[in-house]
């Protein structure tokens, strides 16, 4: 080995080279947390720019580059190390215009912590390991999803579309040229129905158990769908957005409320099952392939 | 496809009765208001008579106490009475309605449709 080799061997071992790494960081992340930034700061800015390039060569001349077995860029953590470093001089030497989108790859120095606590990088490790495991659940469930999201589009597409429309209207008025018209929310209100509170009209359907407009109105199959636009089965995306949402219980009783009322209450059954399927079922199973990773990356 | 197929036109002599219909076809789901409108020779199109789907009525100030309209939804079908014709009521009368139905492909769809109308001549 050569000297320069022995001394960046014996500092890349020293253990208060992990600490300086290590507090420069925690440094780093205090000084990005400043929303107006003193100008001195970006002399502060070159000085951890600088200590992440002295760790890096250190490195580099302790174990090589990339040629051999335990090299610098055959360590995966140290790929993140090399893409700040490299970001870092990108941002401050090179003009590619916008430089605010390759400032927030600074955001990466804080994950720098992750490589240098040792515990912290046994975790992750796990983490990663779930996520290798988890590619089989995860096929499974995309695949339930799919299912019932065609099923759904098959039961529901269009439904959601379904309003009580006022009965009422002028002699030369239509349905039609009601709609080319209509532009604010007070024009909707003035020829859909409204309950008290809520910012889309009242859904309604034509089987017997759906819901039935009040008295004066009538239901129709006009205009967009419930909540902007983007609560829908009319499309196998809308309907997949829809599924995944009922997997995650993510205000998914407005959604059983909404399609209930539209297409009628025989198709509880639809929710039931998927809530049991995808959001009892599924999601424990998930929870399961994680606890089990972590098991075996602990023993 | 909807449809809507007017019947009951004629020639009747002033102060005499007509019972015009109107007939909705097709994969109807729900019919919301129907309406007659009649247009004389060489005049704009004008609204004659009114009827929801939970039967509120509405007329024009020229045929109030002399037209009633009624329909059967269970025919799909709306009527208009015609009682003391004169001989400004002599026109083409035309059915709208407002229609939800299932369309091609199982799709539903909700519109205005208009029949081609049946002529009342009211003349001695």
């Known amino acids: 080995f050569s000297p320069l080799r022995r001394i960046s061997i014996k500092i890349l071992v020293h253990s208060l080279f992990s600490m300086l790494i290590m507090c420069t960081i925690l440094t780093n992340c205090i000084f990005m947390t400043m929303n107006n930034p003193p100008d001195w700061t970006k002399n502060v800015e070159y000085t951890f720019t600088g200590i992440y390039t002295f760790e890096s060569l250190v490195k580099i001349l302790a174990r090589g580059f990339c040629v051999g077995e335990f090299t610098f860029l055959r360590d995966p953590w140290n790929w993140l190390d090399f893409v700040v470093i490299v970001f870092a001089y990108l941002t401050e030497f090179v003009n590619l215009g916008n430089v605010s989108a390759l400032r927030t790859f600074r955001v990466l120095r804080a994950l720098k912590t992750i490589s240098v606590i040792p515990g912290l990088k046994t975790i992750v490790g796990a983490l990663i390991q779930s996520v290798k495991k988890l590619s089989d659940v995860m096929i499974l469930t995309v695949f339930c999803l799919s299912v019932f999201a065609l099923i759904g589009l098959q039961l529901f597409m269009g439904n959601l579309k379904h309003k009580c429309f006022r009965n009422s209207l002028e002699n030369n008025e239509t349905l039609e040229s009601i709609m080319n018209t209509l532009e604010s929310e007070e024009d909707f209100r003035k020829y859909f129905y409204y309950l008290e509170g809520s910012k889309d009209a009242l859904l309604c359907g034509f089987s017997t158990d759906s819901g039935q407009c009040p008295e004066g109105y009538t239901c129709v199959k006009i205009g967009r769908n419930p909540d902007y636009g983007y609560t829908s089965f009319d499309t196998f995306s809308w309907a997949f957005l829809a599924l995944f949402r009922l997997m995650t219980q993510d205000y998914w009783e407005n959604l059983y409320q909404q399609t209930l009322r539209a297409a009628g209450k025989t198709y509880m059954i639809f929710f039931v099952v998927v809530i049991f399927l995808g959001s009892f079922y599924l999601i424990n199973l998930i929870l399961a392939v994680v606890a089990m990773a972590y098991e075996e990356q602990n023993q | 496809e909807v449809q809507l197929v007017e019947s009951g036109g004629g020639v009747v002599q002033p102060g005499g009765s007509l019972r015009l219909s109107c007939d909705a076809s097709?994969?109807?789901?729900?019919?919301?208001?129907m309406r007659w409108h009649r247009q004389a020779a060489g005049k704009q199109r004008e609204f004659v008579a009114r009827i929801t789907d939970d039967s509120a009525t509405d007329y024009a100030d020229s045929v109030k106490g002399r037209f009633t309209i009624s329909r059967d939804n269970a025919k799909n079908t709306v009527y208009l009475q015609m009682n003391s014709l004169r001989p400004e009521d002599t026109a083409l009368y035309y059915c709208?309605?407002?229609?939800?139905?299932?369309?091609?492909?199982?799709?539903?769809?909700?519109?205005?449709?208009w029949g081609q109308g049946t002529l009342v001549t009211v003349s001695s």
């Open positions: 097709g994969r109807i789901l729900r019919i919301g208001y």
């Open positions: 709208e309605a407002l229609v939800t139905a299932s369309v091609r492909g199982g799709s539903i769809h909700s519109g205005t449709y």
